[in-house]
Structures are given as C-alpha cells and as structure tokens.
C-alpha cells in the first residue's frame, strides 16, 4: 500500500521538517525560518509558536517540532500546551476571584497553585493527631488513641505521613 | 489597529517619583483588567501590578506595594502606574498588557505595549 501511495502521491516522500512544494513541481522543500513540519508528506508548514509576553520559551522551534512556553517566574502553566499562565499563591493560600486568600482554618496548601483542602481526619483511620495541621501542612496521623494507653510498654513509630494527592491542576 | 501604547518613562533619581500612562487604540478599555510588568536587563519579566474592569480593585507584588498606585480613568481610556520612592533595582522597562479574563490569567491573545524605560539612578 505504502509503494502505491507513493507512485499516486510524490509528497508522501517528504520527510518531516520539509514540506511538498506545489511551486517546484512537488519536490521536497525545507521548512521556511520560524516554521516547521512534524510530520511526512506535508503540503505546508506551520508557523512555530512565539513565546511572548508572559510565557517565555523552554524549547525553541526546530524544523520538525514547535516550540515549547512556560511561564515568567511567578506564574504557572494551565491547560494544554500551556495555553495560560496563572498567577502562584503562596503556600498556605489559594487563588480565588479576589487574588491569594489563605487557606481557611482546617484547610491547607502545600503548594503555589491548586487549592486549600482539608486536614485528614485520622480518627477515620482510627488514629490519633501527631502533629497539628497548619495552613500550609496537612495534619500528622499517629498511633491509635488505644495504642498510647497507660499500660503500654513501648510506643509503635508511627507510621509515616501519607503524602497528600496533589489537587486537580 | 488594536494596540496598547505605555509613556511616561525616564530617568529619576531614587527617591523620585514617575507616573506611567497606558493608552488604548482601537478598543476600549473599559471591559479589561489591565496589568504592568517589568523587565530588567538580563532578567525574567516580573508581573507587578493589576487593577479589574469590575470593581478597579487594585493588586501589587510584594516589592512594590506601598509605593506604586495603579488606577484607571475609562473616560480617556487610560490606565495609570504611579511610582513613588523609586529604587535603582525599579530599573527596567515596563510593560501594560490587557489579558482577556482577568488579573491572575493571561494567555497568548493578549495585548501587549511595546514598553517604556524607567532608569533610577543618581
């Protein structure tokens, strides 16, 4: 099939970062400067994106694959491709249509983006608190209240700190 | 033609004061938050403030607060920076953009000035 398709069709033999010139009798010309082809057999190239105002480049254009943006430092990437840039929060905050508001009490942020959720509730696990959530730190679930009774000879290391999931981005 | 033109630049001592205008052409903007950015030689561009079309509620980075003033006049379709008690590291040229939601998301159709120098030194 592929042979067939190349007798039917001389531009399947262009190779990515070229592109199939109608102009010249449909031989295989190079990307023009600020575009390119990431993919065989194409009739055009597309022009690489520019990286501009708030989104500075992470890697340039080649004459197979488009550029790459991210974000000027206190921004963030949203969306795909990083369409947008979001403003970071501290942590211990989040963003709301009011700017950075911290987290309310019971809540927590341990990042610069995503929003405040809230502490474990390590009675649910039958624990008991170890250490103390903060707005920026989730709580510290630690031994059952019944392993730390009076009786006990040694207390069992608590287990470690399950790492919160991060928040839908 | 749509675009966003920033003046109002120059040289100050530190200790000095600029008031940068941004002027829009061929929309209005009323319907825009507007933000300044900044950047100095050699550095990233740095957000620095932005005022809402909604309520002109008003926002700065942490290292201008107290010192730089934005507001908005829709009559003249212009948005102001006032800059007070310039520092040598407030050095950079300044940019206004218009994003299209609001004053924590911009985005590749943006506008975007072409910038005005403000150099504080002695």
């Known amino acids: 099939f592929e042979r067939t398709r190349s007798l039917q069709d001389p531009c399947s033999n262009c190779p990515a970062g070229t592109f199939c010139d109608n102009n010249r009798n449909q031989i295989c010309s190079p990307c023009p400067p600020n575009s390119f082809s990431s993919a065989g057999g194409q009739r055009t190239c597309d022009i690489c994106r520019q990286c501009k105002g708030v989104f500075r480049t992470r890697k340039e254009c080649s004459s197979t694959s488009n550029a790459e943006c991210d974000c000027t430092p206190g921004f963030h990437c949203l969306g795909a491709g990083c369409s947008m840039c979001e403003q970071d929060c501290k942590q211990g905050q989040e963003l709301t249509k009011k700017g950075c508001k911290d987290c309310c009490f019971g809540t927590f942020n341990d990042q610069k983006r995503g929003i405040c959720r809230p502490w474990t509730n390590c009675s649910l696990d039958g624990k008991s608190v170890l250490v103390n959530g903060t707005k920026e730190r989730d709580v510290v679930c630690g031994p059952s209240p019944a392993d730390l009774s009076p009786g006990a000879s040694s207390v069992t290391p608590p287990a470690p700190a399950r790492e919160p999931g991060h928040s839908p981005q | 033609q749509v675009q966003l033109q920033e003046s109002g630049g120059g040289l100050v001592q530190p200790g000095g004061s600029l008031r940068l205008s941004c002027a829009a052409s061929?929309?209005?903007?009323?319907?825009?938050?507007i933000g300044w950015f900044r950047q100095a030689p050699g550095k990233e561009r740095e957000w620095v403030s932005c005022?809402?079309?909604?309520?002109?509620?008003?926002y700065y980075a942490d290292s201008v607060k107290g010192r730089f003033t934005i507001s908005r006049d829709n009559a003249k379709n212009l948005v102001y920076l006032r800059m007070n008690s310039l520092k040598p590291e407030d050095t950079a040229v300044y940019y206004c953009?218009?994003?299209?939601?609001?004053?924590?998301?911009?985005?590749?159709?943006?506008?975007w000035g072409q910038g005005t120098q403000v150099t504080v030194s002695s």
């Open positions: 061929g929309f209005s903007l009323d319907y825009y938050a």
């Open positions: 953009t218009a994003p299209r939601s609001d004053c924590f998301h911009y985005g590749e159709n943006d506008y």
């Open positions: 005022i809402m079309s909604s309520d002109s509620s008003a």
